[in-house]
């Protein structure tokens, strides 16, 4: 019998230092580019190899970014969110939401999958 798929949602503060090639990730989302249905939030779509985010190791593809340097990312156009990151300075604080897939099988069997966005 197959168990149902649930999600464990956690939040984390990630402090990145901008590297020679920047922060090293891509985003999707925004009020004009909804990536998740009925959610205009900003999501990490790519972590670039050897970039600042990849070297730090905590930010994951599929994470939702809630704020940048304390500034909320709710209800932003996609390009406005991009510009916010580009102008965020050398030290960048990200509040992120990780979504971990949890497979709930028969009693006593609980496995964890990869984060999914």
């Amino acid at each position: 019998m197959n168990g149902r798929v649930d999600y464990l949602v956690t939040e984390e503060e990630i402090n990145l230092t901008r590297g020679p090639s920047g922060l090293g990730f891509n985003i999707v989302g925004g009020t004009d580019q909804q990536y998740v249905s009925n959610d205009s939030g900003i999501y990490v779509s790519r972590i670039k190899e050897n970039g600042a985010a990849a070297l730090d190791g905590r930010l994951q593809e599929g994470d939702k970014i809630l704020s940048v340097n304390g500034q909320d990312l709710k209800n932003l156009l996609h390009q406005d969110a991009v510009d916010l990151f580009r102008n965020a300075g050398y030290a960048v604080s990200l509040r992120v939401q990780h979504r971990l897939q949890v497979q709930n099988g028969p009693i006593g069997h609980r496995g964890e999958g990869d984060p999914s966005g």
Partner: nanobody, 128 residues
Framework: EVQLVESGGGLVQAGGSLRLSCAAS????????MGWFRQRPGKERDVVAT????????YYLDSVKGRFTISRDNAKNTVFLQMNSLKPEDTAVYYC??????????????????????WGQGTQVTVS
């Protein structure tokens, strides 16, 4: 981690057609930029065609324009390369590639235009 499995390669006569498919799994397909690359005997791997995550932007190698068409089906987590009017010089191993799409938070101009993070094993196309 993204897993990519190509299919549809084979032996075809010059002027014929093939349709390559690449099935992706491991993360939401709808956020992935996808590409087809090829490696001809004794040559470097070249980009053939790419399609962005939203499906509204494509790129083609000059020598395949008008003959090859890249498309995607997000419901099936699959990208296709329709190859018509095949020529002997199209003989190569064809690779599917993927990367997260979207906008770089770093620069308007991203130097890694054809940098992809995930690769399939390749499928052989031979045009006689």
């Amino acid at each position: 981690e993204v897993q990519l499995v190509e299919s549809g390669g084979g032996l075809v006569q010059a002027g014929g057609s093939l349709r390559l498919s690449c099935a992706a799994s491991g993360r939401p397909f709808s956020s992935l930029d996808m590409g087809w690359f090829r490696q001809r005997p004794g040559k470097e791997r070249d980009v053939v065609a790419t399609i962005n995550w939203t499906g509204d932007s494509t790129y083609y190698l000059d020598s395949v324009k008008g003959r090859f068409t890249i498309s995607r089906d997000n419901a099936k987590n699959t990208v296709f390369l329709q190859m018509n009017s095949l020529k002997p010089e199209d003989t190569a191993v064809y690779y599917c590639a993927a990367r997260g799409g979207g906008s770089s938070v770093d620069s308007e101009y991203d130097a890694g235009e054809f940098e992809y993070d995930y690769w399939g094993q390749g499928t052989q196309v031979t045009v006689s």
